[in-house]
């Protein structure tokens, strides 16, 4: 039945964003406020956990922004990237399913800079597997729920 | 039944990427290794062939990159583009369903450049129709399976 | 049944694009020509109206372009943005579901500039709610049907 299909749409919780500019895993997401919601999947320890085998469409939208009032950037040449990774509890190694992003030159000539990444793809996921999001330059993330989010919905069963 | 729905997720086969900076059709894709998979659709001659009428969600993620160790770019002003096209066997002309990309200035001041494009949309596809991917600057494509891929999954029947 | 699921894919009608560089709501879209289509949803007054409660995947692809033959840009520093908004008839306020875009420096050193945005996400929509698209710099929109479009398809019922 259509209403039993698992899904999740998780929005960034910006109260706990790491300070470095290196690639980090984002562990704080909302699952039950505003646009965020989850059904027949689990959110735990910063990971979206699959409870039901199937083929899922996965997506992520990540927005970065900088305003001159936030201070001077340590470097004007930035790699703004997202990696959607899958981890299997049985085999504790993670694999990148999707990546996207851009190198950017955010010069001091402009008072405001913005950039968004969107990735999406169709993947076979097994119960117990975990989806997580890694980004570079996390302190540049846009904390709005319409800006930085990821999600999944089940499309079909595995044969 | 959910498990009968056609789908494909095809990842770039970088062993056979054309050189040049012009627009080319990408014909080498994996369909059965790593994240690549196909069911109730066919991959042949560089095209994804529809076997079952329906409305499908189509998507593509295309990543371009350049490192200074690869040599100097012929021009620093680039058009990095993707075109998702549909060809009908009955009417041998192709039509662009979706396009995306950006003009970029990849200056020698930075040793590494990266840029990703994502497009997606919902289309009516008939059995026998073929989906293919065209890009500009194919020699700049990122060959990773998480970077450059396209796919489709059937959402519903045609009334 | 699969064939009863609502969907829409609307492509830009460029005969009526507002001028200016501010954020505007785009009200002219095709729903029944070329790739544009609609079923069990309604298009009215520039808004896509939900007729059936459910969880929908929403997406938008927005392309901007400028050629020097179009004249000089008023500013070379641009904010090229899209906002996918939801309005409820009961509560006449609009909320942004998704946003994306980039600040761009489109210098006169290049004769042609192009940039595309893609956003997508999974949202609960109720009958009577309306989806609309706002963009900045509408006069820079690419009017092709493969370039500037948005859509939705129902994935599952609400529990």
């Amino acid at each position: 039945k259509l209403e039993a299909q698992p899904f999740a749409h998780l929005t960034i919780n910006a109260t706990d964003i790491p300070s470095g500019s290196h690639k980090v895993s984002l562990s704080s997401w909302y699952h039950d406020r505003g646009w965020a919601k989850i059904s027949n999947m689990t959110f735990s320890n910063g990971k979206l956990i699959v409870n039901q085998d199937g083929f899922y469409y996965l997506y992520a939208n990540i927005c970065f922004r900088h305003h001159e009032t936030s201070g001077d950037l340590a470097t004007e040449y930035l790699q703004l990237m997202v990696y959607v990774t899958k981890t299997s509890i049985k085999i504790p190694s993670s694999h990148t399913l999707m990546k996207g992003g851009s190198t950017k030159y955010w010069s001091g000539n402009s008072e405001f800079h913005f950039y968004s990444i969107n990735v999406g793809g169709f993947f076979k996921l097994r119960s117990g597997e975990e989806i997580s999001i890694e980004v570079s330059n996390p302190s540049l993330l846009d904390p709005d729920q319409d800006a930085t989010y990821f999600g999944a919905f089940k499309v079909r069963d595995i044969d | 039944k959910l498990e009968a729905q056609p789908f494909a997720h095809l990842t770039i086969n970088a062993t056979d990427i054309p050189s040049g900076s012009h627009k080319v059709s990408l014909s080498s894709w994996y369909h059965d290794r790593g994240w690549a998979k196909i069911s109730n659709m066919t991959f042949s001659n560089g095209k994804l062939i529809v076997n079952q009428d329906g409305f499908y969600y189509l998507y593509a993620n295309i990543c371009f990159r350049h490192h200074e160790t690869s040599g100097d770019l012929a021009t620093e002003y680039l058009q990095l583009m993707v075109y998702v096209t549909k060809t009908s066997i009955k009417i041998p002309s192709s039509h662009t369903l979706m396009k995306g990309g950006s003009t970029k200035y990849w200056s020698g001041n930075s040793e590494f450049h990266f840029y990703s494009i994502n497009v997606g949309g919902f289309f009516k596809l008939r059995s026998g129709e073929e989906i293919s991917i065209e890009v500009s600057n194919p020699s700049l494509l990122d060959p990773d399976q998480d970077a450059t891929y396209f796919g489709a999954f059937k959402v519903r029947d045609i009334d | 049944k699969l064939e009863a699921q609502p969907f829409a894919h609307l492509t830009i009608n460029a005969t009526d694009i507002p001028s200016g560089s501010h954020k505007v709501s785009l009200s002219s879209w095709y729903h029944d020509r070329g790739w544009a289509k609609i079923s069990n949803m309604t298009f009215s007054n520039g808004k896509l109206i939900v007729n059936q409660d459910g969880f929908y995947y929403l997406y938008a692809n927005i392309c901007f372009r400028h050629h020097e033959t179009s004249g000089d840009l008023a500013t070379e520093y641009l904010q090229l943005m899209v906002y996918v908004t939801k309005t409820s008839i009961k509560i006449p306020s609009s909320h942004t579901l998704m946003k994306g875009g980039s600040t761009k420096y489109w210098s006169g050193n290049s004769e042609f500039h192009f940039y595309s945005i893609n956003v997508g996400g999974f949202f609960k929509l109720r009958s009577g709610e309306e989806i609309s698209i706002e963009v900045s710099n509408p006069s820079l929109l690419d009017p092709d049907q493969d370039a500037t479009y948005f859509g939705a398809f129902k994935v599952r019922d609400i529990d």
Partner: antibody
Framework: QVQLVQSGGGVVQPGRSLRLSCAAS????????MHWVRQAPGKGLDWVTV????????HYADSVKGRFTISRDNSKNTLYLQMSSLGPEDTAVYYC????????WGYGMDVWGQGTTVTVSS | DIQMTQSPSTLSASVGDRVTITCRAS??????LAWYQQKPGKAPKLLIY???SLESGVPSRFSGSGSGTEFTLTVSSLQPDDFATYYC?????????FGQGTKVEIK
Amino acid sequence: QVQLVQSGGGVVQPGRSLRLSCAASGFTFSGYGMHWVRQAPGKGLDWVTVISYDGSNKHYADSVKGRFTISRDNSKNTLYLQMSSLGPEDTAVYYCAKSLSGTYWGYGMDVWGQGTTVTVSS
Amino acid sequence: DIQMTQSPSTLSASVGDRVTITCRASQSISSWLAWYQQKPGKAPKLLIYKASSLESGVPSRFSGSGSGTEFTLTVSSLQPDDFATYYCQQYNRYSWTFGQGTKVEIK
């Protein structure tokens, strides 16, 4: 735990050179800017130089410009300060320090090395 | 370069006292000011960043305020471990400078 371990100090004659090292552990070194700060005997703190997380941006105090060079090797998690044309006024305890924010300047220095003494004397 | 002037240079106080140290910048630095504590023979320790943000692990009796050119560090109730030298440090346009320091000693 997060720490910075310094080495390379000593006594050097005026006009000569010296290289200081700072080995980082317990955090992602490649994600943060790094500073050198010095303190002359009985005096206050004196900022010397900084390098961005990726090594692309370097800034120096006027007093050391053209004489000192900051560098880093992210593969070795190590920060360096190459000092040349040293004079008695460069005598100080030298500290390496991690920038609190990797992306932005201005947030302060949250982790400091133990300090290494440089004495310039004939 | 921007000059930072701390006052007082020396401060005598007792355990439990409320102590305030002032730092003035020669021109506006917005909120780009940090405060450090240093004990003899030890490296400095970050207390406050961005004028008023408390560094993780620092006791809440420490607080910072101010913006533009005038800043203060307050210790609400001085503890035995707080006797040390305190430095302010500004950042402005790729230049960092420290104040001359304030020594807090036992009365």
